[in-house]
């Protein structure tokens, strides 16, 4: 089946890297400068990725493969192939409509991108805390307490208030 | 490389008080918490006592609740624990530890300090 | 208050010997239990949390495995280093409790 196929087809001898020209009577010509086929038998070349202002280049384009981009750093690629860069935040923050905003008491983002999120609740499994959550880090949950059996609730301390210079517990 | 150093070790005849210290280095104090863990001679490991990251959660094992204040200073990455009304057998080596966590959970203990001996003797 | 049993208290084995160890807990722990090796006259060092997850730079001739009530420490071939007190530890609630410990001698 291959052998008939390029004995009908003689586009499908040309490699990656070339593309069958039917100006020139179906001869493989090398792709173009910034143009690129990764994959044989192509009748054209794709047009190189350009990354350029908030995009940089983390693979130049070759004849058979096509150029990536990464985001310039304060940035973060979104999107498949990172088609979109995002600008970062601080840990404890989240990107809003209106820029970074820190994150709200209960919440934390412990990463430069994404949404905050809210903290474990220790309580749900009858956990005591061991770390109290911050805007940047998660509570951490430790033993049961000893007068409650898993499942049981209000085994959580409130909150110690924030002393100067210090995340709480 | 986290590092813990136990002192205060000694001692004291039953009815006494002592103040163990373990100095931390390393690690980011006040975001673990610590814990207590005591050997007598010849015998096994015995939890005594943990307390929160920021000093508001405090728990101790039954045999020595009302006795000994576990503490901390977190400014000096510091952990103590007060031993009043002393009895023969609280007689051991005090380790201090870190406690280890994983994700959002923990309570098992890592590291360990190299331990401070306390006798109860008369 | 949970007990944690251990067993053997102790064995002899020879090396290159493949070594278990057994911690049963005397209610569920889920997966909350962490094993620890003493030498004489040293601090325990952790090896396992989390009843099978290894403690960073403890070799993988350790393994732990179980949930529940029932938990094996294994060391799939057992070097002179090895020969020392190995204790279960379960996190699951307070108070914390250890087995009694297992010595693994020389034989």
């Known amino acids: 089946f291959e052998r008939t196929r390029s004995l009908q087809d003689p586009c499908s001898n040309c490699p990656a890297g070339t593309f069958c020209d039917n100006n020139r009577n179906q001869i493989c010509s090398p792709c173009p400068p910034n143009s690129f086929s990764s994959a044989g038998g192509q009748r054209t070349c794709d047009i190189c990725r350009q990354c350029k202002g908030v995009f940089r280049t983390r693979k130049e384009c070759s004849s058979t493969s096509n150029a990536e981009c990464d985001c310039t750093p304060g940035f973060h690629c979104l999107g498949a192939g990172c088609s979109m860069c995002e600008q970062d935040c601080k840990q404890g923050q989240e990107l809003t409509k209106k820029g970074c905003k820190d994150c709200c008491f209960g919440t934390f983002n412990d990463q430069k991108r994404g949404i905050c999120r809210p903290w474990t609740n220790c309580s749900l499994d009858g956990k005591s805390v061991l770390v109290n959550g911050t805007k940047e880090r998660d509570v951490v949950c430790g033993p049961s307490p000893a007068d409650l059996s898993p499942g049981a609730s209000s085994v959580t301390p409130p909150a110690p208030a924030r002393e100067p210079g210090h995340s709480p517990q | 490389e986290v590092h813990l150093l136990e002192s205060g070790g000694g001692l004291v005849q039953p009815g006494g008080s002592l103040r163990l210290s373990c100095a931390a280095s390393?690690?980011?104090?006040?975001?673990?918490?610590m814990g207590w863990v005591r050997q007598a001679p010849g015998k096994g490991l015995e939890w005594v006592s943990i307390i929160g990251g920021g000093g508001g959660s405090t728990y101790y094992a039954d045999s020595v609740k009302g006795r000994f204040t576990i503490s901390r200073d977190n400014s000096k990455n510091t952990l103590y624990l007060q031993m009043n009304s002393l009895r023969a057998e609280d007689t051991a080596v005090y380790y201090c530890?870190?406690?280890?966590?994983?994700?959002?959970?923990?309570?098992?203990?890592?590291?360990w300090g190299q331990g401070t001996l306390v006798t109860v003797s008369s | 208050d949970i007990q944690m049993t251990q067993s053997p208290s102790s064995l002899s084995a020879s090396i290159g010997d493949r070594v278990a160890i057994t911690c049963r807990a005397s209610q569920g722990i889920s997966n909350y239990l962490a094993w620890f090796q003493q030498k004489p006259g040293k601090a325990p060092k952790s090896l396992i949390y989390a009843a099978s997850s290894l403690q960073s730079g403890v070799p993988s001739k350790f393994s732990g495995s179980g949930s529940g009530t029932d938990f094996t420490l294994t060391i799939s071939s057992l070097q002179p280093e090895d020969f020392a007190t190995y204790y279960c530890?379960?996190?699951?609630?307070?108070?914390?409790?250890f087995g009694g410990g297992t010595k693994v001698e020389i034989k």
């Open positions: 390393g690690f980011t104090f006040s975001s673990y918490a």
């Open positions: 530890a870190k406690v280890g966590y994983s994700g959002t959970y923990g309570g098992w203990f890592d590291p």
């Open positions: 530890q379960q996190y699951n609630s307070y108070p914390l409790t």
